[in-house]
């Protein structure tokens, strides 16, 4: 029986040219994680983290994707084309496959600075990464 829970970064926005953490976390299961796949909205693989072999970043993303923190990915030098869905797929034994979804919206710098739609009060942040000023969650 699959008892696990996947938590994700959720819906986030980030500034063009900046970076963002894509993160998933599997809990509530004793299953062993054998591999984590990271896919983009068009189903192309960004990276794979195999429990035995470690990380493999696909050539098309080598310059802009850094492994970690943890089993997550850091997407750098963001472009408007990076807007869209991202998926983490946890391959586990004996449970099987768990899948999490993240939606990233990349904003033009001026929009990111001034758009009220994504602004969260400075003491009301619900994200955590290396440059919190430029990353916002929206529901």
């Amino acid at each position: 029986m699959m008892t696990g829970t996947i938590e994700t970064t959720g819906n986030i926005s980030a500034k063009k040219g900046g970076s963002v953490i894509l993160q998933c976390h599997l809990s509530s299961t004793m299953a062993q994680v054998t591999q984590v796949n990271w896919e983009q909205h068009d189903h192309s693989l960004l990276a794979i983290r195999n429990a035995e072999l470690g990380w493999h970043i696909y050539p098309a993303f080598k310059d802009r994707v850094a492994p970690g923190p943890g089993l997550g990915l850091t997407l750098q030098s963001l472009t408007m084309n990076d807007t869209g869905e991202y998926f983490c797929t946890y391959h586990t034994y004996p449970d099987g496959t768990y899948r999490g979804r993240i939606f990233l919206e990349v904003l033009e710098s001026s929009v990111a600075e001034h758009s009220a739609r994504f602004q969260i009060p400075i003491e009301g942040r619900d994200y955590k990464d290396d440059d919190d000023k430029h990353h916002h969650h929206h529901h």
Epitope: T5, E7, T8, T9, G10, N11, I12, I21, L22, Q23, H25, S27, G68, P69, G70, L71, G72, E123, G124, R125, D126, Y127, K128, D129, D130, D131, D132, H137, H138, H139
Partner: antibody
Framework: EVQLVESGGGLVQPGRSLRLSCAAS????????LHWVRLGPGRGLEWVSR????????DYADSVKGRFTISRDNAKNSLYLQMNSLRTEDTALYYC????????????????WGQGTLVTVSS | DIVMTQSPLSLPVTPGEPASISCRSS???????????LDWYLQKPGQTPQLLIY???TRASGVPDRFSGSGSGTDFTLKISRVEAEDVGVFYC?????????FGQGTKLEIK
């Protein structure tokens, strides 16, 4: 096995300084944000400060802002709290705590706590 | 900042009887990933706090199934189906959605 061991507490006069340390082991230290939480006499748990996995994001409770400084050394798997201009109301048992989820999701709570180090501020 | 309000602050219970603690947040704890970030902690006398329940209703590893959590948005409840002597201590709810993190005032469970 995850372990968090605090040290550095003691008796100090008001206005003086103290530096707390927390030595961590048993998990990928540089993938998680860490916190300081305190338990004062006759009071409940009070959150003090948080530092992100790479020190890029730091937050403090209003009660300690401008007086306390949180830092970490990922090479040494260590967390610190520099406490300046101490007040009697800072008297408490100080715990370091590990976030439950790795960087990028949200605070998500604390799955492991240290045993605490006692800070007593008195003249 | 999010304010957490717990009730009751004191809870005398007879062993074997059920117990319930309420927790209310001043704003929604719903994250964009669909989860409500509400935790319950228990601090037993002379011990370090321990995580009991996270994401409103998920029991932490090793927590007995007599503990259960429920609720959504701003109203949450911790239930103990049958209180045991070892449950004595202070129960705290905490919002884990954002900083500054905030705890409820704590509910002291005592055995009658």
């Amino acid at each position: 096995e995850v372990q968090l061991v605090e040290s550095g507490g003691g008796l100090v006069q008001p206005g003086r300084s103290l530096r707390l340390s927390c030595a961590a082991s048993g998990f990928t230290f540089d993938a998680y944000a860490l916190h300081w939480v305190r338990l004062g006499p006759g009071r409940g748990l009070e959150w003090v400060s948080r530092i992100s996995w790479n020190s890029g994001s730091i937050d403090y409770a209003d009660s300690v802002k401008g007086r306390f400084t949180i830092s970490r050394d990922n090479a040494k798997n260590s967390l610190y709290l520099q406490m300046n201009s101490l007040r009697t109301e800072d008297t408490a048992l100080y715990y370091c705590a590990k976030e439950r989820t790795p960087a990028g999701i949200t605070v998500a709570g604390f799955d492991f706590w240290g045993q605490g180090t006692l800070v007593t501020v008195s003249s | 900042d999010i304010v957490m309000t717990q009730s009751p602050l004191s809870l005398p219970v007879t062993p074997g009887e059920p117990a319930s603690i309420s927790c209310r947040s001043s704003q929604s704890l719903l994250h964009s990933n669909g989860f409500n970030y509400l935790d319950w902690y228990l601090q037993k006398p002379g011990q370090t706090p321990q995580l009991l329940i996270y994401l409103v209703s998920t029991r932490a590893s090793g927590v007995p199934d007599r503990f259960s959590g429920s609720g959504s948005g701003t109203d949450f409840t911790l239930k103990i189906s049958r209180v045991e002597a070892e449950d004595v201590g202070v129960f705290y709810c905490m919002q884990a959605l954002q900083t500054p993190c905030s705890f409820g005032q704590g509910t002291k469970l005592e055995i009658k």
